[in-house]
Interface confidence: low
Amino acid sequence: APLKIQAYFNETADLPCQFANSQNQSLSELVVFWQDQENLVLNEVYLGKEKFDSVHSKYMGRTSFDSDSWTLRLHNLQIKDKGLYQCIIHHKKPTGMIRIHQMNSELSVLANFSQPEIVPISNITENVYINLTCSSIHGYPEPKKMSVLLRTKNSTIEYDGVMQKSQDNVTELYDVSISLSVSFPDVTSNMTIFCILETDKTRLLSSPFSIELEDPQPPPDHIP
């Protein structure tokens, strides 16, 4: 199974080769290269020297080879860099190339969503409900769930909205939001609203949004 590697958007991923080099072979007799799941070449060290004529343009200038750890660093990570990578080592002999080592890695690229933000889109209507939107931006992968917590002195109610998501065509990052019409329980106490974004790994909480309720007006007399 491939080694699983996680790294963050716009940062650097380390793609290891994990070559024990038990024969103590010099780089000057080896051809070391990394390729992606499409077999496009990221980096090639040919007999000790970095060689660029087979490197695909999308990786050009984005890699650096650490000869001490036999690791390739892929910089300025994009979401589209996620996937499988192979480090392959050939021993160059007069008779030709002999593959002596292969290492497979699976790269996941993550981007942290921003702290969810609650924005009211209507005033409180006769102390009955409020329309609000909660949004979080520039994350990857898409989150599992987005919800709103309405907390009073005596109770906590969770509202699950339909999560709207959009994905940037270039960066592939997600922006997500939910819009809710939150109705208030029959209480006179103040309440606090939180927005929660759940991903596979984290639970992000918005800053509290506080609502101070006025005393409810008595209902008009009921006339049959």
Partner: antibody, heavy 122, light 107 residues
Framework: EVQLQQSGPELVKPGTSVKMSCKAS????????IHWVKEKPGQGLEWIGY????????KYNEKFKGRATLTSDKSSSTAYMELSSLTSEDSAVYYC???????????????WGQGTLVTVSA | DIVMSQSHKFMSTSVGDRVSIACKAS??????VVWFQQKPGQSPKLLIY???YRYTGVPDRFTGSGSGTDFTFTISSVQAEDLAVYYC?????????FGGGTKLEIK
């Protein structure tokens, strides 16, 4: 010598499916991506997608997604393409193609099969 | 998708002439362009890779040039056996796309 031997011509009815094969020889099958390309008379060449037989990763042209299915069989060094819901627009020659050697330059469509002619007709 | 445009569907030339075929990409594809030759009833054959490099065994009368969006394929002295359709293709990004092809006819 690298060779890609494709299956013979197919005459199929609209609405059905067709599965064609591409048998590779002369190299390590799992080391190279296999692409599939459509040639429609007078309309040139169109990339359908690829499969990397090493880990069966596939990528499709959105235009063919859902209708083309690429698979491979390591034991027989054979790549397959199945096309479903066929119409007369699918009447064409279909080629498989292999990329070149990564350590001597990486050119995606270096070796080609002889093509499989598919005719869709009622 | 990146569109590869070959301005001429047909070109007529004589043996010994020099002929150039143009190919334009709808966006920058660096030098990730290849040229294929397809003779009647045959599979395409790779001639030029990375815009300007001749593939192994390809005669030196075939050359390629260009980068970014504008590319040219040239046959310096056309031979009778060069009768074929010539395609440019980008593999800068998927979906890989081909030009519409230019059919070279020998007078």
């Amino acid at each position: 010598e690298v060779q890609l031997q494709q299956s013979g011509p197919e005459l199929v009815k609209p609405g059905t499916s067709v599965k064609m094969s591409c048998k590779a020889s002369g190299y390590t099958f799992t080391s190279y991506v296999i692409h599939w390309v459509k040639e429609k008379p007078g309309q040139g060449l169109e990339w359908i997608g690829y499969i990397n037989p090493y880990h069966d990763v596939t990528k499709y042209n959105e235009k063919f997604k859902g209708r083309a299915t690429l698979t491979s069989d390591k034991s027989s060094s054979t790549a397959y393409m199945e096309l479903s819901s066929l119409t007369s627009e699918d009447s064409a020659v279909y080629y498989c193609s292999r990329q070149g050697d990564p350590y001597s330059g990486n050119y995606q469509f270096t070796y080609w099969g002889q093509g499989t002619l598919v005719t869709v007709s009622a | 998708d990146i569109v590869m445009s070959q301005s001429h569907k047909f070109m007529s030339t004589s043996v010994g002439d020099r002929v150039s075929i143009a190919c334009k990409a709808s966006q920058d594809v660096s030098t990730e362009v290849v040229w294929f030759q397809q003779k009647p009833g045959q599979s395409p054959k790779l001639l030029i890779y990375s815009a300007s490099y001749r593939y192994t065994g390809v005669p030196d009368r075939f050359t390629g040039s260009g980068s970014g969006t504008d590319f040219t394929f040239t046959i310096s002295s056309v031979q009778a056996e060069d009768l074929a359709v010539y395609y440019c293709q980008q593999h800068y990004s998927t979906p890989y796309t081909f030009g519409g092809g230019t059919k070279l006819e020998i007078k």
